[in-house]
Interface confidence: low
Amino acid sequence: PRSIDVKYIGVKSAYVSYDVQKRTIYLNITNTLNITNNNYYSVEVENITAQVQFAKTVIGKARLNNITHIGPLDMKQIDYTVPTVIAEEMSYMYDFCTLISIKVHNIVLMMQVTVTTTYFGHSEQISQERYQYVDCGRNTTYQLGQSEYLNVLQPQQ
């Protein structure tokens, strides 16, 4: 079998809301993946599991099942959303994210994603990790070409 390539493209959008009483930030982060099938047969993308970390703490997880199949020598772009919550011991971030006098409220998040593909009964997992800046102070949509600009570190091999 030839390789199945997973490329994390970046954050597509981040939608934010707040709970003033609980000093809590809710961020729905939509990410984009490109999955390329370099084989001469179809493969199934069985599931995508993702999690987001802030300051080494997991703040959100998501799992998508039975997503799609990818034809021979084909590529599919898949968006997935991870709902995240910044609260409790990280509630100090509430002040930063709601501070009106600065224009960009960037926080550094680690995006972790694992894609499970199957073909002929064989299962393969491919993982990526990427640090990204996300604006926690407003709803933001990013151009896909912009994502590389947002990358702080290259993915770990």
Partner: antibody, heavy 118, light 113 residues
């Protein structure tokens, strides 16, 4: 140890521009905003503007637009301020400072004295 | 622009005394989103850069002695120094930390009697 090391004092003639620097160390340069503040003799502190090293974004006090230009070189973790069309009014001590969670600078450079004199 | 007005412009004190200085802003510095007041206090000694003492109107910066206390809300703020020490002699500035352009008061100079 967090440090903002500014360039030395300068004595310049009226007219030509001057560029002063602020080298950061001891923290992640692109995570902070770098502010510039002017202290004139017998006057209060005046906020000139800020630059965000992460993307080069700037915000100026309207009063200093056209007078000051703020830039960064992330490869050397250095912020720069260029002052043009110099007059005696520009004679002052200029400070760089950093902020993160708010706009209260917690670390300041030692200051650069600019003297404009013919 | 938000105008910051400090009073008095100078204060003469003896060591051990308690002093208060005032700062008024032309607009409220209260952020309704999180109910915090965005005002800072700085201390500046001759030949030195300003030093952050208080932010958020009342939160002491780490390492700042607890004899420095910030209070107030909205447009009226106060810095109190109890048991003044000789090393406290300096100019004290308040700063609008709420919106651009950031603005400073003219300062209150603390002198020895």
């Amino acid at each position: 140890e967090v440090q903002l090391q500014q360039s030395g004092p300068v004595l310049v003639k009226p007219g030509p521009p001057v560029k002063i620097s602020c080298k950061a160390s001891g923290f992640t340069f692109t995570d902070y905003y770098i502010h510039w503040v002017k202290l004139s003799h017998g006057k209060s502190l005046e906020w000139i503007g800020l630059v965000y090293p992460y993307n080069g974004d700037t915000d100026y006090n309207q009063k200093f637009k056209g007078k000051a230009t703020l830039t960064v070189d992330t490869s050397s973790s250095t912020a720069y301020m260029e002052l043009n069309s110099l007059t005696s009014e520009d004679s002052a001590v200029y400070y760089c400072a950093r902020t993160y969670y708010a706009n209260s600078p917690d670390y300041w450079g030692q200051g650069t004295t600019v003297t404009v004199s013919s | 622009d938000i105008v910051m007005t400090q009073s008095p412009s100078s204060l003469s004190v003896s060591a051990g005394e308690k002093v208060t200085m005032s700062c008024k802003s032309s607009q409220s510095l209260l952020n309704s989103g999180n109910q915090r007041n965005y005002l800072a206090w700085y201390q500046q000694k001759p030949g030195q850069p300003p030093k952050l003492l208080i932010y958020g109107a009342s939160t002491r910066e780490s390492g700042v002695p607890d004899r420095f206390t910030g209070s107030g809300s909205g447009t009226d703020f106060t810095l109190t120094i109890s048991n003044v020490q000789a090393e406290d002699l300096a100019v004290y500035y308040c700063q609008n930390d709420h919106s651009y352009p950031l603005t400073f008061g003219a300062g209150t100079k603390l002198e020895l009697k």
